[in-house]
């Protein structure tokens, strides 16, 4: 259902991009439903700091706090994940520093630690102490949720000691896990008490039971393992940008798209434009004009620059962009006031037009 | 899970056209493209072309925009690709593919007088 | 169009093996970059994006490298199960072309 007619067709691609977006994978931090989660805006020198979530502004509320530079999520949910960034706004300039929230049943990830210290969790009892199983290291096991990234190692342990010795096998979400559930297989340290899988993936998800027992007894301990996927995502643009904007007749006035993408982006900056005195085409979609768009003869795409604007000039604009995966855009308004009226603070104007998320 | 189902094979004739459907489901449809990308046999990938579902934007391989139709049906979360005038060489397997992270099982068009 | 060669367009190892396979592209594509592997009668999966990024579910055996014009993807240590042919992918511009592809067999 496509929802405008472009006056003037252009490629969605760039043919010589910019390379200044940051395209690397943010850092992850993950949380357990109902926890709290607290994360510091890594950026120096802040004057002020503003908080985004998945391109949205955000503000506090009963479980958001922001309190300087740090940001608190209260009784956080799976809604609450998502792409965050902070902004420090300066006196000269701003940067804006991204990171990934997840919020599943885990809350961190596996124990990727060597078993250098895996011999002293071999406990040897004395032979004529007959003895049920029991824990050695609980500290190694207070770890009960791990969310892990895709194709990364686990480790789970159960250090563990009885007399006579006794022997541990493990369980998948309470049934026998056996080599050939899942590709690659597991390897058993028996003498580290450790279940270790190699490449996770997401089918790899569930609860791993160690199951601990001698002729005297047996104890078990749960593990749930949550495979954290990791994909390219579509664009994602700062909030509140592009700012709406006035300026007299004759003045010049910039708009500014500020765009955080881990696949090539490409820009294009959009009006409303009039054609043979309509704005709407016979099917009734409103007419649009690519003004500017990333590639070879433009420079940097993330600013629209209009000089010597005309009241023509006013209306809304939009940026907008795309990647191979998605798009994203949002929109601006531009106020054209006669010669002799100076400019003051425009009133935000929020506009989305039908066809635009 | 993200699952992409295709519609099953099809034989034609040359200078007949095909749709081959794919049936999104598992995320939200609007937020990705979908591409086309078909196989001939023995042969290698071929990107055709993609569709945003979210407002219909389009982008085609030159080589195929004047014979493929891309359309979007949002309500059944459903993509199509329309090949028209078709000749033996677009005998293929037909791949559609939620912005090349996950792929449809795939379409074998055969064309054959 | 931005034209993809890859190479070799197929080879042969041992299983445990270091395996690399490159891919140039005509022009520089900034690290748009997509590897799959396709086994027969598969679909193609995604193994790397953005040049150097495994996929979800991708064992860590397979890496990708590169900027520019010039691309590289490395098994690590060859396993019977990646027997396939591995095809590279520019994702930065219209039309989205591929590479011919490497068929990687066992010796």
């Known amino acids: 259902r496509p929802s405008f007619s472009l006056v003037e067709d252009t490629t969605l691609e760039p043919e010589e991009p910019p390379t200044k977006y940051q395209i690397s994978q943010p850092e992850v931090y993950v949380a357990a439903p109902g926890e709290s989660l607290e994360v510091r805006c890594l950026l120096k020198d802040a004057a002020v700091i503003s908080w985004t979530k998945d391109g949205v502004h955000l503000g506090p509320n009963n479980r958001t706090v922001l309190i300087g530079e740090y940001l608190q999520i209260k009784g956080a949910t799976p809604r609450d994940s998502g792409l965050y960034a902070c902004t420090a706004s300066r006196t000269v300039d701003s940067e804006t520093w991204y990171f990934m929230v997840n919020v599943t049943d885990a809350i961190s990830s596996g124990d990727d630690e060597d078993d250098t210290d895996g011999a002293e969790d071999f406990v040897s009892e004395n032979s004529n102490n007959k003895r049920a199983p029991y824990w050695t290291n609980t500290e190694k096991m207070e770890k009960r949720l791990h969310a892990v990234p895709a194709a990364n190692t686990v480790k789970f342990r159960c250090p563990a000691g009885g007399n006579p010795m006794p022997t541990m096998r493990w369980l998948k979400n309470g049934k026998e896990f056996k080599q050939e559930h899942r590709i690659g297989g597991y390897k058993v340290r028996n003498q580290h008490w450790s279940l270790i899988m190699e490449s996770v993936v997401p089918s790899d998800k569930g609860n791993y039971t160690c199951v601990v027992e001698n002729e005297y007894g047996s104890i078990n301990h749960t593990y749930h393992l949550d495979v954290v996927e990791r994909s390219p995502h579509r664009p994602i643009l700062q909030a509140g940008l592009p700012a709406n904007a006035s300026t007299v007749v004759g003045g010049d006035v910039e708009f500014v798209c500020k765009v955080y993408s881990d696949a090539q982006p490409h820009i294009q900056w959009i009006k409303h434009v009039e054609k043979n005195g309509s704005k709407y085409g016979p099917d009734g979609l409103p007419y649009l004009k690519v003004l500017k768009h990333s590639g070879i003869n433009s420079s940097n795409a993330e600013v629209l620059a209009l000089f010597n604007v005309t009241e023509a000039d006013a209306g809304e604009y939009i940026c907008k962009v795309s990647n191979y995966i998605g798009q994203a855009n949002q929109s601006a308004w531009l106020t054209v006031l006669p010669k002799q009226q100076a400019p003051g603070r425009e009133k935000e104007i929020t506009a989305s037009p039908d066809y635009l998320e | 899970q993200v699952q992409l189902v295709q519609s099953g094979a099809e034989v034609k004739k040359p200078g007949a056209s095909v749709k081959v459907s794919c049936k999104a489901s598992?995320?939200?449809?609007?937020?990705?493209?979908i591409h086309w990308v078909r196989q001939a046999p023995g042969q290698g990938l071929e990107w055709m072309g993609a569709?945003?579902?979210?407002?219909?934007?389009?982008s085609y391989n030159q080589r195929f925009k004047v014979r493929a139709t891309l359309t979007a049906d949002t309500s059944t979360s459903t993509v199509y690709m329309e090949l028209s005038s078709l000749r033996s060489e677009d005998t293929a397997v037909y791949y559609c593919?939620?912005?090349?992270?996950?792929w449809g099982q795939g379409t074998t068009v055969t064309v054959s007088s | 169009d931005i034209q993809m060669t890859q190479s070799p367009s197929s080879l042969s190892a041992s299983v445990g093996d270091r395996v690399t396979i490159t891919c140039g592209a005509s022009?520089?594509?900034?690290?748009?970059l997509n590897w799959y592997q396709q086994k027969p009668g598969k679909a193609p999966k995604l193994l790397i994006y953005?040049?150097?990024n495994l996929a979800d579910g991708v064992p860590s055996r397979f890496s990708g490298s590169g900027s520019g014009t010039d691309y590289t993807l490395t098994i690590s240590s060859l396993q019977p199960e990646d027997v396939a042919t591995y095809y590279c992918q520019n994702v930065l511009s219209t039309p989205y072309t591929f590479g011919g592809g490497t068929k990687v067999e066992i010796k």
């Open positions: 953005g040049a150097t």
């Open positions: 593919a939620r912005a090349f992270t996950y």
């Open positions: 022009e520089n594509i900034y690290g748009a």
């Open positions: 569709i945003y579902p979210d407002n219909g934007d389009t």
């Open positions: 598992g995320y939200t449809f609007t937020n990705y493209y």
